[in-house]
């Protein structure tokens, strides 16, 4: 609700500074508050524009200040206007010279339709002139000079709404400058009635509150609050929720408060007089001191609050037993709340007695929209109202107000809401690598749209065309590996950023699609790699019978050990061998194979082979003769790798015998490095030669080795081991 208050300080202008302050209390007007001259009430007043400034002591308040030298230009009628959501509220007031010939009894006077009304002006200057009375600047009545009484009155025996207006009194020789003003407000309805046809009954508006003839609501005087104005504010406070404060040394002294019609103007509670600078007499309280304390049980009367009831008593006269009412207090509401756009459930928590009910707690948005609780609960000490805003957006940022209005009073607490835009990545994640069951992803979380800081990041993924929920993993690094994926499946990927606070999950960013590889077939079985020539190797395998209909082929990878030379060969799936050609002689090659369909298969173990040699093999090295007995001896040797050595020949003969009497032992397994010669003669000297053979020929021994067998009785000497052919 709009709470507009106009403070006229002081309405009687002397040579002191005077001002008008217009306050929008507890709400934020859509358009600026305006203060202007009320030409409807007084046509022929001063035309000078007003210097309206911001009141620095309040957030939503405007002020006009007249310095003492401008006193002559002040007389007249003024208004303050505020607007919210198409509804305008206008408050009117007047200023007049303190040295005027007449002074009004009150600045405004509110009466009900049909009331018997006397509008009175007190004569303060005696002149030998006729007195004249005007209404809204038009002459209505005069009193001959000899008959001008001390109290000049306009009598309206049966007041009607058309009687309302600004009445002014002066001597005929005077002018606007010497006029006194009072404004008559006539409620459209008779006493205690309201409504378009005035046939509804008003709520009791206590403490001189006034029933609004259009809505039936009470307009409470400054210093009282609540639905029926029964609750007194804290000392020196005013406004619909008593949250505005009079900053003067003596509180609200010298402040005339003007509220929307039909209230008009009055002093704050505890003060009276045209200038609101006179304290109430003992036994009186309230605005203009019009209320009389009739406290039961001899309770004390406070001029601001009325009867101060003892514990266990309540009511205006302390006439009711019960827990004394306690003004509601809003608790646990921070001054600033950061909210993520989306659903928002603000909570208003209040204490007081009686505890506020759900209909007594509201939330006002910055644009003036009033929200009612969606949920409500209360404990012994607190009422908790939970509101629901289904979609709060950044334009909703600003000052929100939690408002509590009970019979014990009203309180409002403004708090600032800052609505943040949820973050969303601008780019889709990138797929760096995939296999049949994994993918390596760069999540590309920056740049992003919306507000940070980013609290966490989620990588969301799911198979395309599956009615599965999105799965997600929390990620901390930009590069992440997704494991346990299904093979040969198209996946969707996106990134969701999360900012701090409830509901901080942003919308997922752009989607990237990728497909995992099929599960690879096993490698060919029975792989065998053999040299074929100096420049070819032959790889063979068992026939392949795949389980699916898919086309397949064998991929063979060969690489040289000595050189950085690699080649991959595709072999049709119906073949069982491949000749690896254009190789280098006497070179070692590593070969592996796999069976590929659309997906790549698993590699076999590495196979190693040398191409055939292009030169004679070198002589076996490290030739040793050991374990010599009377009839045997062990010969051992080593050979160099890479010369395609296919066999070793040991040639021996008794020394001195002819060449053609030698014995040749051919060892066709080149991996054997030891051989035992048997059937030798005891105590005999033998000449032993050893050759290596390859595809080119035999090696050339540089010298022969001598072996002498032992006599028959002697034990053998053990001279080392190695692989032995027996």
């Amino acid at each position: 609700a709009m709470d507009l208050i106009l403070i006229n300080s002081l309405p009687l202008v002397s040579d002191a500074e005077t001002s008008l302050t217009c306050i929008a209390s507890g709400w934020r007007p859509h358009e600026p508050i305006t203060i202007g001259r009320d030409f409807e009430a007084l046509m022929n007043q001063h035309q000078d524009p007003l210097e309206v400034t911001q009141d620095v002591t309040r957030e939503w308040a405007k002020k006009v200040v007249w310095k003492r030298e401008k006193a002559s230009k002040i007389n007249g009628a003024y208004f303050c206007e505020g607007r919210v959501r198409g509804e305008a509220i206008r408050i009117r007031t007047m200023k007049m010279r303190q040295q005027a010939s007449f002074l009004p009894a009150t600045l405004t006077m509110t009466v009900d339709k049909g009331d018997n009304v006397n509008i009175s002006f007190k004569k303060v200057l005696i002149k030998e002139e006729d007195a004249v009375i005007y209404k809204n600047g038009s002459f209505i009545h005069s009193v001959p000079r000899h008959e001008v009484p001390d109290i000049l009155e306009v009598h309206l025996p049966h007041a009607q709404p058309q009687d309302a207006g600004v009445y002014s009194a002066r001597y005929i020789g005077g002018n606007l400058f010497t006029s006194a003003f009072t404004r008559l407000i006539v409620r459209r309805c008779e006493a205690q009635k309201w409504g378009p046809e005035c046939n509804h009954l008003c709520t009791a508006c206590m403490n001189n509150g006034v029933c609004h003839e259009d809505t039936g609501e009470c307009i409470c005087p400054p210093g009282f609050m609540g639905r029926t104005c029964e609750k007194a504010c804290e000392l020196h406070t005013f406004g619909r929720t008593c949250k505005e404060r009079c900053s003067g040394q003596e509180g609200c002294k010298s402040y005339v408060f003007c509220l929307p019609d039909p209230y008009g103007c009055s002093c704050a509670t505890g003060w009276k007089g045209l200038q609101c600078n006179e304290a109430c007499h003992p036994g009186f309280y309230g605005p203009d001191c019009k209320l009389r304390c009739s406290c039961n049980n001899g309770e004390m009367c406070d001029r601001f609050q009325g009867c101060l009831c003892s514990p266990g008593w309540q009511g205006l006269q302390c006439e009711r037993e019960g827990i004394p009412r306690m003004t509601p207090k809003i608790v646990d509401l921070p001054d600033h709340i950061e909210v993520n756009s989306g659903k928002f459930n603000p909570i208003c928590k209040a204490s007081g007695w009686p505890l506020p009910t759900n209909e007594e707690m509201t939330l006002v948005k910055p644009d003036g929209t009033v929200l009612h609780p969606k949920d409500f609960n209360h404990t012994d000490h607190f009422s908790v109202a939970i509101f629901t805003i289904h979609r709060i957006l950044p334009p909703d940022s600003g000052v929100w107000v939690c408002s509590v209005n009970t019979v014990a009073g009203m309180v409002e607490k403004p708090f600032n809401i800052s609505v943040k835009v949820l973050p969303k990545p601008l780019n889709a994640p990138n797929v760096i690598d995939t296999g049949h069951n994994f993918a390596v992803i760069n999540i590309s979380s920056e740049p992003y749209f919306g507000d940070g800081p980013i609290k966490s990041k989620k990588l969301l993924y799911k198979p395309v065309n599956h009615y599965e929920a999105w799965q997600h993993i929390q990620v901390t690094n930009e590069i992440v590996t997704l494991n346990y994926l299904e093979p040969r499946t198209e996946y969707e990927l996106c990134v969701q950023l999360v900012r701090r606070g409830e509901g901080g999950e942003g919308h997922p960013g752009p989607v990237r699609r990728f497909t995992t590889a099929s599960i690879g077939l096993p490698p060919p079985r029975g792989l065998n790699l053999l040299p074929k020539s100096q420049t070819t190797l032959n790889l063979t395998w068992q026939p392949i019978f795949p389980s699916s209909e898919d086309d397949f082929y064998v991929e063979v990878e060969r690489r040289s050990v000595q050189k950085s030379d690699q080649q991959n060969i595709k072999v049709p799936g119906n073949l069982t061998s491949v000749l690896l050609n254009n190789l280098h002689p006497r070179e070692q090659y590593v070969v592996r194979a796999r069976v590929n369909t659309k997906a790549q298969g698993e590699w076999s173990e590495d196979l190693t082979a040398w191409t055939l040699s292009d030169i004679l093999p070198p002589q076996p090295e490290n030739i040793k003769i050991s374990n010599i007995t009377h009839s045997s001896a062990v010969i051992s040797w080593t050979i160099l790798d890479g010369y395609s050595i296919s066999s070793i020949t040991i040639r021996y003969k008794v020394q001195g015998k002819n060449e053609d009497q030698h014995v040749d032992v051919k060892i066709k397994n080149a991996t054997i490095t030891q051989y035992q010669l048997k059937g030798l003669e005891p105590e005999t000297a033998y000449q032993v030669d050893i050759f290596a053979e390859n595809n080119i020929g035999s090696s050339n021994p540089a010298f022969s080795h001598e072996l002498v067998t032992l006599p028959e009785s002697q034990a053998p000497a053990d001279l080392g081991g190695g692989k032995m052919l027996l």
Partner: antibody, heavy 117, light 113 residues
Framework: QVQLVQSGGGVVQPGRSLRLSCAAS????????MHWVRQAPGKGLEWVAV????????YYADSVKGRFTISRDNSKNMLQLQMNRLRSEDTAVYYC??????????WGQGTVITVSS | DIQMTQSPDSLAVSLGERATINCKSS????????????LAWYQQKPGQPPNLLMY???TRESGVPDRFSGSGSGTDFTLTISSLQAEDVAVYYC?????????FGQGTRLEIK
């Protein structure tokens, strides 16, 4: 919580009288006007009477004028409806209610009146 | 007295669908001075008193879910339930308070289809 608790319903013969009561709690009863509304079986709502906060002003529906009297005792937080010369068409559930402006905000639980011979 | 007429008398709507209840007054309940419509809506469930939903034709009473909304001006008004829930099954009444005596519509029974 503000509550209105009703009592005094029952079966009564045509031409006889009955008094309904409505007790208010957690409400500054003396500050509010009070209404009576009734609902005949299977029918809609019909406003019956209203009384001002101080009991000075009372208004009645034409159908009950002269037979029903609305009253209140602010010292006891009590609202009453005295029903005389009852007719069969007065058979209804009777509700007391407090206004919020011109709408009726808080309702009693209702009390059943059956007028039958 | 101002007569209030509701339509339809009864209405069956599927869960989650929109329900619309109309109310017509025999004379305008719009007060030009403040541009307010003096109309209220109530919900009444079996065995319970009526419950205030709306006043000033479109101001939702506290605690009323925001799927309920009121619209219209002058003589023609509408109560809309944007997405019907099982707990919304009830009789709905409009009421004018432009002039005394306050008068109610005959009611609209809302059921689930």
């Amino acid at each position: 919580q503000v509550q209105l608790v009703q009592s005094g319903g029952g079966v009564v013969q045509p031409g006889r009288s009955l008094r309904l009561s409505c007790a208010a709690s957690a409400l500054t009863f003396s500050n509010y006007a009070m209404h009576w509304v009734r609902q005949a079986p299977g029918k809609g709502l019909e406003w019956v009477a209203v009384i001002s906060y101080d009991g000075e002003n009372k208004y009645y529906a034409d159908s009950v004028k002269g037979r029903f009297t609305i009253s209140r005792d602010n010292s006891k937080n009590m609202l009453q409806l005295q029903m005389n010369r009852l007719r069969s068409e007065d058979t209804a559930v009777y509700y007391c209610a407090t206004p919020k402006g011109g709408a009726l905000e808080i309702w009693g639980q209702g009390t059943v009146i059956t007028v039958s011979s | 007295d101002i007569q209030m007429t509701q339509s339809p008398d009864s209405l069956a709507v599927s869960l989650g669908e929109r329900a619309t209840i109309n109310c017509k007054s025999s004379q305008s309940v719009l007060y030009s001075s403040n541009n307010k419509n003096y109309l209220a809506w109530y919900q009444q469930k079996p065995g319970q008193p009526p419950n205030l939903l709306m006043y000033w034709a479109s101001t939702r009473e506290s605690g009323v879910p925001d799927r309920f909304s009121g619209s219209g001006s002058g003589t023609d008004f509408t109560l809309t339930i944007s997405s019907l829930q099982a707990e919304d099954v009830a009789v709905y009444y409009c009421q004018q308070y432009y002039s005394a005596p306050i008068t109610f519509g005959q009611g609209t029974r809302l059921e689930i289809k």
